[in-house]
Amino acid sequence: ETDEEPEEPGRRGSFVEMVDNLRGKSGQGYYVEMTVGSPPQTLNILVDTGSSNFAVGAAPHPFLHRYYQRQLSSTYRDLRKGVYVPYTQGKWEGELGTDLVSIPHGPNVTVRANIAAITESDKFFINGSNWEGILGLAYAEIARPDDSLEPFFDSLVKQTHVPNLFSLQLCGAGFPLNQSEVLASVGGSMIIGGIDHSLYTGSLWYTPIRREWYYEVIIVRVEINGQDLKMDCKEYNYDKSIVDSGTTNLRLPKKVFEAAVKSIKAASSTEKFPDGFWLGEQLVCWQAGTTPWNIFPVISLYLMGEVTNQSFRITILPQQYLRPVEDVATSQDDCYKFAISQSSTGTVMGAVIMEGFYVVFDRARKRIGFAVSACHVHDEFRTAAVEGPFVTLDMEDCGYNIPQTDESTLMT
């Protein structure tokens, strides 16, 4: 069930020095300050649970305020190997090396970690985002160029006494932030090596990590305002479901997205929203302070529990899935973008979901915990929730088995 007893020393309690160590906003990612090299070079690094490389800008780029200068580091070691990472849109490429890395507002340790020095990129860095690199916190299986490149967190755990666990509290502002406000704002917390009780309310509920590559989980049921979408649960996880702090939206497989939008439209039919709103193209606006949150439904995702035939649900509010956007042309209004979108690579529980919850990536016990975040945006009538247990049968059938293309698995 919720498993509130302490496991090992240092796993729980207060991590004051790490609280509020993240900045940013959901649309452009959350970043932590890190130092690389000797003497230390300070960089802001995007926290990304959807990838596994530690990669930093290492050459001038129009969108970077600063970058890693390897030639200035006495502890840099060249691995004499290149790395190329293409995305559906865009790419980055660079040179692999190792150097000393620490997190000023993290555990008081320094580790030698693999670093991809990005020398060329396209559609990777974001103008005005204020981060210069990415910290991939997922598993070695998805590291580039291959799984032999040890990810940062693995190096951290191996070289120190930091427990094999981290937790994230991403705090959506609930209102748009301009550039100066972002620089001054608190974006949340990354607690390395433990769980901080002050960052959540209620109990933590855990779902198994299905496979250690992405942080893959299994969704067993979806409800819109308590109404079951009634789809074969395999559809919810086609071809996988992952928890990804580096993605803005809640992304859903095509069929699930269409069913969810149909249901959200029906629930909010007192107003007629343009088709472009559901596509994420058009904003919708209301006179400042009059956003009718009540006309939008809550969305519940039921996740496989730790006990056989037991699940729990996480429920988000429109305050999470309607993302505030500042537009000078409509500045007298509160304007929002629909932050649920279609995916061809499975469900992605991005910042839209994570901003409602304190999320524990308990790698040691191969599970992910969810509790209601102490900083989530809500109103006086509804709040995000994590509730259970619920009885759900045949949950294993909800997982999709990606066909193996590896030649070693083919019959001869």
Partner: antibody, heavy 116, light 107 residues
């Protein structure tokens, strides 16, 4: 200040193609879609299509699907429209516009003249 | 496609007058209508969104109203710089469509 800077006028021969550009500034480029529109004298404004700079997703007016191709270069915050197999019917003023609620920002216009 | 009809191509008015430009949608578009002003040889200038909301910086003599299929742009205390063309647009569904325009002229 939000600005959309369009490329200059084009004089092209029938059957040729042309690529118009629209450079955005003053806002986070990947946050808003860019649209392209056509205006011919006495025929009002026609919506050609749109592109999402964050992932290059495009949506076209069926009428222009075979005529226009939209692309984006985020490194320069520029959107492009390629018009192919030009005829006199394609002689028009073309605009890029940024989404928000409807089209709050417009480029300054590009005149395309198709003439032998 | 949704047809947006501005039945009057031209409207005569005088400086200081109040004038109403109308636009009719061929099907229900809710309040998802915008109005633009265009000086000949220039880009359209946005005036109204969501049928009745003024874009930032638009003078309050411009007022939008309507929902469903019938929409009106009212200009009170017409100024000489208002003697230009006005377009309505629906952004309720794709493809986005515009009215044919209404030109204000001096009586």
């Amino acid at each position: 200040e939000v600005q959309l800077q369009q490329s200059g006028p084009e004089l092209v021969k029938p059957g040729a193609s042309v690529k118009l550009s629209c450079k955005a500034s003053g806002y986070t480029f990947t946050n808003f879609w860019i649209h392209w529109l056509k205006q011919r004298p006495g025929q009002g404004l026609e919506w050609i299509g749109m592109i999402d700079p964050s992932d290059s997703y495009t949506k076209y007016n069926q009428k222009f699907k075979a005529k226009a191709t939209l692309t984006v270069d985020t490194s320069s915050s520029t959107t492009y429209m390629h018009l192919s197999s030009l005829t006199s019917e394609d002689s028009a003023v073309y605009y890029c516009a940024r989404s928000g609620v409807a089209f709050p920002y417009w480029g300054q216009r590009t005149l395309v003249t198709v003439s032998a | 496609d949704i047809l947006m009809t501005q039945s009057q191509k031209f409207m005569s008015t005088s400086v200081g007058d109040r004038v109403s430009v109308t636009c009719k949608a061929s099907q229900n578009v809710g309040r998802n209508v915008a109005w633009y002003q265009q000086i000949s040889g220039q880009s359209p200038k946005p005036l109204i969104y969501s049928a009745s909301h003024r874009y930032s910086g638009v003078p309050d003599r411009f007022t939008g109203s309507g929902s469903g299929t019938d929409f009106t742009l009212t200009i009170s205390n017409v100024q000489s710089e208002d003697l230009v063309e006005f377009f309505c647009q629906q952004y309720n569904s794709y493809p986005y469509t515009f009215g044919g325009g209404t030109k204000l002229e001096i009586k």
